[in-house]
């Protein structure tokens, strides 16, 4: 299983190796190293990876993860049963479909087993963390002499997804893009029969079933039109 550890995005405040908490004096204030943030993504509502940057620890530490759902039938604390590893150190946890409840508040707790008071608890809205698989089975057909229709399929409830279509010809420096709602079809009203077109699509779990910010991967491209482009310098990039 290949896993990618998602690293911080350059917020300068997160780079310190430690900090002294400045909690009010009447609290149980201890100077502790902060635990890394946990980032979770739900892949097509088939499984979820919750990962952390294990290299942020000053020494290799097998942090442990527990989770539960707030105010639900699933509020019993669960131990991670399938850890992900980076260089033999725990760096994530994978949850299977039966353990994912999209519309309940997901609570995840990271803990240092050598120092149990060193723990961090986060809450997450899983419906905002869904990343669908890339669209599949792109097909093109002519509606008229100059009009093309692009269709595709998603391995998910179609009404939950919005889409972004990009297309360009061999002569274009950049992509033209068009947002498409849950209907997963796109029409291009005027097609130049002398040009070769390339289309690709990606999808997002938004806005009807969740408010995810992350898009799927791009689909495999699909091409339409003339294959002869002698004076076209951009064709190689499309075929790469």
């Amino acid at each position: 299983l290949n896993t990618t550890i998602l690293t911080p995005n350059g917020n300068e405040d997160t780079t310190a190796d430690f900090f002294l908490t400045t909690m009010p004096t009447d609290s149980l204030s201890v100077s502790t190293l902060p635990l890394p943030e946990v980032q979770c993504f739900v892949f097509n509502v088939e499984y979820m990876n919750c990962t952390w940057n294990s290299s942020s620890e000053p020494q290799p530490t097998n942090l442990t993860l527990h989770y539960w759902y707030k105010n639900s039938d699933n509020d019993k604390v669960q131990k991670c049963s399938h850890y992900l590893f980076s260089e033999e150190i725990t760096s994530g946890c994978q949850l299977q479909k039966k353990e994912i409840h999209l519309y309940q508040t997901f609570v995840v707790q990271l803990q240092d087993p050598r120092e149990p008071r060193r723990q961090a608890t986060q809450m997450l809205k899983l419906q905002n963390l869904v990343i669908p698989w890339a669209p599949e089975n792109l097909t093109l057909h002519k509606l008229s002499e100059s009009q093309l229709e692009l269709n595709w399929n998603n391995r998910f409830l179609n009404h939950c997804l919005e889409h972004l279509v990009q297309y360009r010809t061999d002569w274009d420096h950049s992509w033209t893009e068009q947002s498409v709602d849950y209907r997963h079809k796109f029409s291009l009203p005027s097609v130049d029969g002398q040009k070769r077109y390339t289309f690709r699509v990606r999808s997002r779990f938004n806005p009807l079933c969740g408010s995810a910010q992350h898009w799927s991967e791009w689909s495999h491209p699909i091409h339409w039109g003339s294959n002869t482009s002698k004076e076209n310098p951009f064709l190689f990039a499309l075929e790469a």
Epitope: N9, D13, T14, T21, P34, Q119, A120, L124, N128, Q213
Partner: nanobody, 126 residues
Amino acid sequence: EVQLVESGGGLVQAGGSLRLSCAASGRTLSRYAMGWFRQAPGKEREYVAIDSWGGDTFYADSVEGRFTFSRDNAKNEVYLQMNSLQPEDTAVYYCAGAPTSFATTAYSSSNSYRYWGQGTQVTVSS
């Protein structure tokens, strides 16, 4: 270094409302997880409302539907609107902030916050 200063506490009758403010100086809060916590005498500090900089907000069960968290990044302030206050809400209320890398990070654990205000007293009389 971030300094957090709370205001808006006071004495109010049961059923009344208060709006707490937390003003930050020293750095923008736009990429900070923020939280409101409270501590009643003899009790542990507990989270009241927490928020990620991506806009996901969570409330403690005891205040859900009565309290509302909001933030104004332009003013570098966060707020807690407290309605239908009850005597059990009496406590010192603290604002806390933690710089985070991910837009979805919202901490309910108090030890995850780097910066704290000095607190503002809220007293609800019956």
